[in-house]
Amino acid sequence: KLLQVSTIAMQQQEKLIQQERALLNFTEWKRSCALQMKYCQAFMQNSLSSAHNSSPCPNNWIQNRESCYYVSEIWSIWHTSQENCLKEGSTLLQIESKEEMDFITGSLRKIKGSYDYWVGLSQDGHSGRWLWQDGSSPSPGLLPAERSQSANQVCGYVKSNSLLSSNCSTWKYFICEKYALRSSV
């Protein structure tokens, strides 16, 4: 009988230890949840305040209407230029209108003067058609003025107030474009 009682007592003690462990785990879990909630709230607040304070374009980018432009300070070939833009969440400049072309050339005059800048225009090797990087065709007034004599792939660039063409493997500055952040205010 005594043996039975001591066995029951041991079982009860074991149960108590398990419950204490469960309670400890629960307390730890609750604390962890609270910390996570705090972290989440802080993260959300930071995100919201930075979104509220942020300008439509990053630092060193120029805004015009719904676009942000970055004029590079380094030279690279056309393909590397494209990758450099992608790293910044942008693509090579795609000129949609004469107004945009005028804005770009006007800005370039102020910034750097008469240099060559790659844009997102290339000539299909088979058809000879000029296409923007997203596959769309340039408007008739925005076709490169001269056909490059290169046997290699040909890409478009801006110089002064003209669109020209050159071997894609030549080194030039480049212009990236991304969408401006919409203001929620």
Epitope: K87, G89, S90
Partner: nanobody, 115 residues
Framework: QVQLQESGGGLVQAGGSLRLSCAAS????????MGWYRPALGEQRELVAA???????TYVDSVKGRFSISRDNAKNTVYLQMNSLKPEDTAVYFC?????????WGQGTQVTVSS
Amino acid sequence: QVQLQESGGGLVQAGGSLRLSCAASGSIFSINAMGWYRPALGEQRELVAAITTGGRTTYVDSVKGRFSISRDNAKNTVYLQMNSLKPEDTAVYFCKAFTRDEDFWGQGTQVTVSS
């Protein structure tokens, strides 16, 4: 770190279609763009198509009008819809994530187009 997992490759007849998927995990908030690459003659890999987080796209001339890149932000996945496939599209297609500081590559998925 960003981990990328490609899928969707396979064997298809010329003129057929395939859709490749690239799922990103890890530090996805640092990704500014994602793209698909394939080996090219004389170069290591050529950029086939890419899409930025803002939705801007770029394609290599040889696939314009046939391939389309898109993304599903909720699934952290980028897709490459490949239509009117040609034997010359046969390659291992690699997914790449662009961040400001470094680039991350997937293991690749084989696409074979038979004539």
